[in-house]
């Protein structure tokens, strides 16, 4: 029997053991987070699968993921949302220490999908482990991109109080309008619930003493946020290593000086 023809995409295929990984992550998450113990992980997997299985992987919509979002609904306390752009590792290191602050990947749905790739095929119940659409080379409405757009929008919509965002000061565009933060999250913060956005610009070089809060892209971010009737603040984090150390040990004498 000849193998059935399969669409070839430019991106890497579904992560090995994807269903098992999602299910295992869900079980682990619900064991560690008492407020999510009620979650039925099999139902979560069924809804996740339902979003992309049997569907053409370049025609996925936000609507497809809403049943999953419904099952994974979680609230973050006001003032405790941390967004990030192009500096995921430091943001996650921070919330691992500062346990009362949360990135999207600290929430159930973000945790389930973090660093995974997935896609299906039109009219079959198979998962495609060979290749998946690449955002640039194939299409933007692919299962992974639409998932992150959907959950990021929801995460921003539900944020309240003072929202923080960690930005990478080493990049040419510290604030990038085309990033998930710039294209989705910024525009879905709700002015009636969010008083302010505070940007933390993370410096790369040890000797970098520039005020990156004056960067043109940060001014652009300030303008976008201010037009949405949300106040904007910006802080330079000159020494990210020291910053993390001081989050761990705020009593340390060296933490009384600037970071």
């Amino acid at each position: 029997v000849l193998p059935r023809w399969r669409q070839q995409w430019s991106g890497s295929g579904t992560t090995s053991r994807f269903p098992e990984t999602v299910l295992a992550r869900c079980v682990k998450y619900t064991e560690v987070h008492p407020e999510m113990r009620h979650v039925d992980c099999q139902s979560v997997w069924d809804a996740f699968k339902g979003a992309f299985i049997s569907k053409y992987p370049c025609n996925i919509t936000e609507e497809d993921y809403q049943p999953l979002v419904k099952l994974g609904t979680q609230t973050v306390p006001c003032n405790k949302t941390l967004l990030w752009s192009r500096i995921k590792d430091l943001a996650h290191q921070f919330t691992q220490v500062q346990r009362d602050m949360f990135t999207l990947e600290d929430m159930l749905l973000g945790y389930l999908a973090d660093d995974l790739t997935w896609c299906g095929e039109f009219n079959t119940f198979e998962i495609n482990y060979q290749s998946c659409p690449d955002w640039r080379k194939d299409c933007s409405n692919n299962p992974v991109s639409v998932f992150w757009k959907t959950v990021s929008r929801r995460f921003a919509e539900t944020a309240c109080g003072v929202v923080h965002v960690m930005l990478n000061g080493s990049r040419s565009k510290i604030f990038d309008k085309n990033s998930t933060f710039g294209s989705v999250e910024v525009h879905n913060l709700q002015p009636e619930k969010v008083q302010a956005l505070e940007a933390w610009v993370i410096h790369g070089g040890r000797e970098d003493s520039r005020d990156l809060c004056q960067d043109p892209t940060i001014k652009e971010l300030e303008s976008i946020i201010s037009k949405r009737n949300i106040r904007f603040f910006c802080k330079n984090i000159y020494r990210p290593d020291k910053f993390l150390q001081c989050v761990k040990n705020p009593e340390d004498s060296s933490c009384l000086s600037g970071i």
Epitope: E62, E63, Q66
Partner: antibody
């Protein structure tokens, strides 16, 4: 033939209780989310409650939260709505409906059962 | 008060094309479905997943969605199309919500 059949509607006094049932046939009941939808006399449709396929998740309209409980018995292919602390404004025809792939639409409806709350 | 807004009534003559609209912010990111309720009967699904027709629904019924609005079009209007028409979607809390309904009269 795919079918839903409601029962249990009755005349009940304010503050009273009632349990509605909906028997399903012709499809794999345990694979589908199910809903209760009601329609007051001369009014439009109002969503009441949802239950997930395995029964582990339930959702309610604000107007019935804390008073109504949706449940299901997949072994019996039956959906239930337990209605407590009934009010005059709960008077309506109650329909059970099968959800098509979660959020596509409600593709199968029962014929409805009438609940009248009056003293 | 429904978060999906429909005109209370619409009318047309036999053979005409009639459009019924539905609007609400939650439509943007959620599927829209449409239901027909003939007098004294249970609702019937006409359109699911924004524009798709279940088998058995005539192709005279079509639908579309754009942004925060959706519409149902009935072409070649017939007397048996006289009914109440409801749009439905999930709301911002991801629970079902119905429009207030549009009563269609065939003149």
């Amino acid at each position: 033939e795919v079918q839903l059949l409601e029962s249990g509607g009755d005349l009940v006094q304010p503050g009273g209780s009632l349990r509605l049932s909906c028997g399903a046939s012709g499809f794999t009941f345990s694979d589908h989310y199910m809903s209760w939808v009601r329609q007051a006399p001369g009014k439009g449709l109002e969503w009441v409650a949802d239950i997930s396929a395995r029964g582990s998740n339930t959702w309610y309209a604000d107007s019935v939260k804390g008073r109504f409980t949706i449940s299901r018995d997949n072994s019996e292919n039956t959906l239930y709505l337990q209605m407590n602390s009934l009010r005059a404004e709960d008077t309506a025809v109650y329909y059970c409906a099968k959800n098509w792939n979660y959020n596509y639409g409600m593709d199968v409806w029962g014929q409805g059962t009438t609940v009248t709350v009056s003293s | 008060q429904s978060v999906l807004t429909q005109a209370p009534s619409a009318s047309g003559t036999p053979g005409q094309r009639v459009t019924i609209s539905c609007s609400g912010s939650s439509i943007q990111n959620n599927y829209v479905s449409w239901y027909q309720q003939l007098p004294g009967t249970a609702p019937k699904l006409l359109i699911y997943r924004n524009f798709e027709r279940p088998s058995g629904v005539p192709d005279r019924f079509s639908a579309s969605k754009s942004g925060t609005s959706a519409s149902l079009a009935i072409s070649g209007l017939q007397s048996e199309d006289e009914a109440d028409y409801y749009c439905a979607s999930w709301d911002d809390s991801l629970n079902w919500v119905f429009g207030g309904g549009t009563k269609l009269t065939v003149l």
